[in-house]
Interface confidence: medium
């Protein structure tokens, strides 16, 4: 397995609707045909897989139907969107990229994007 550089923003603030988007960019050493992107969440030294998609270059990313992630690809960039986030989901979201085909296999892991999620304040009771 060969190492590959992956870049992602350090910090992203989720919208009031619990949606966070960030770009994951990888330095492809060759012409990859099949790429696998995995989003990992690190919180309290625990790492869990949030979502994953395998795509062919030039095609759309396809996550599972029940996934909270969506994404698009353009060249060596993947635009990832995570939905349904709540304050408790605040944490470090790491982008892992694997160039699956052709050989040789390359693996790159970003430093992570700290996503801050603030639950919206409930609307105050109104007299009118």
């Amino acid at each position: 397995c060969k190492a590959m550089h992956v870049a992602q923003p350090a910090v992203v603030l989720a919208s009031s609707r619990g949606i966070a988007s960030f770009v994951c960019e990888y330095a492809s050493p060759g012409k990859a045909t099949e790429v696998r992107v995995t989003v990992l969440r690190q919180a309290d030294s625990q790492v869990t897989e949030v979502c994953a998609a395998t795509y062919m270059m030039g095609n759309e990313l396809t996550f599972l139907d029940d996934s909270i992630c969506t994404g698009t690809s353009s060249g060596n960039q993947v635009n990832l969107t995570i939905q349904g986030l709540r304050a408790m989901d605040t944490g470090l979201y790491i982008c892992k990229v694997e160039l699956m085909y052709p050989p040789p296999y390359y693996l790159g892991i970003g430093n992570g994007t700290q996503i801050y999620v603030i639950d919206p304040e409930p609307c105050p009771d109104s007299d009118f």
Partner: antibody, heavy 124, light 107 residues
């Protein structure tokens, strides 16, 4: 039953052309990388070429680069190898073989299904 | 290109014997190695993938091990039906390359 059946081999003169076909059945052809591997009489195995799922990626051994063209028709579940400028050293049994399944989380490239082979003889 | 060197090129053993074949890669290929069996006049058959994983339906007397540049293929108890030529193959990088083969015969 998962099966690969090659055809199109035969006797051809040096400098001539030949097109091999490989008909696939029993599996989702479009989901797999496909390969051609050859074996000269009494010799070992030599990888020749590979093509990705969509046909967008093609790969060749140096010994055939510029002379052979791999292609596929997913609607017909068929793999092809167009061989031009044939030489005596291209004489071999040509096998098509199934490679990687698209989207497999684990990286790997094993030829788990092979055809019976078709003999190509280049001679004057 | 990655060269794969198999040894021995041929061997003769008795039924029930333990047979060992080695394969050496010219550079580090991690565990990206497969083993195939080819009987005379037949297409090759996958036995071991990823250096040590037994393909479905293959008898457990066949095994593989190794990582990096040195790999070993073992038939723990040779059977008459194991008469064949065995090949290693690397998939670390294109071009994919095979070892020259080891012909196994019964004494």
């Amino acid at each position: 039953e998962v099966q690969l059946v090659e055809s199109g081999g035969g006797l051809v003169q040096p400098g001539g052309s030949l097109r091999l076909s490989c008909a696939a059945s029993g599996f989702t052809f479009s989901s797999y990388v496909m390969h051609w591997v050859r074996q000269a009489p009494g010799k070992g195995l030599e990888w020749v070429s590979a093509i990705t799922w969509s046909g967008r990626g093609t790969y060749y051994a140096d010994s055939v680069k510029g002379r052979f063209t791999i292609s596929r028709d997913n609607s017909k579940n068929t793999l092809y190898l167009q061989m031009n400028s044939l030489r005596a050293e291209d004489t071999a049994v040509y096998y098509c073989a199934r490679g990687r399944l698209f989207g497999l989380a684990l990286y790997g490239e094993a030829f788990d299904v092979w055809g019976q082979g078709t003999l190509v003889t280049v001679s004057s | 290109d990655i060269q794969m060197t198999q040894s021995p090129s041929s061997l003769s053993a008795s039924v029930g014997d333990r047979v060992t074949i080695t394969c050496q890669a010219s550079k580090d290929i991690s565990n990206y190695l497969n083993w195939y069996q080819q009987k005379p006049g037949k297409a090759p058959k996958l036995l071991i993938y990823d250096a040590s994983n037994l393909e479905t339906g293959v008898p457990s007397r066949f095994s593989g091990s190794g990582s990096g540049t040195d790999f070993t293929f073992i038939i723990s108890s040779l059977q008459p039906e194991d008469i064949a030529t065995y090949y290693c193959q690397q998939f670390n990088s294109f071009p994919l390359t095979f070892g020259q083969g080891t012909k196994v015969e019964i004494k």
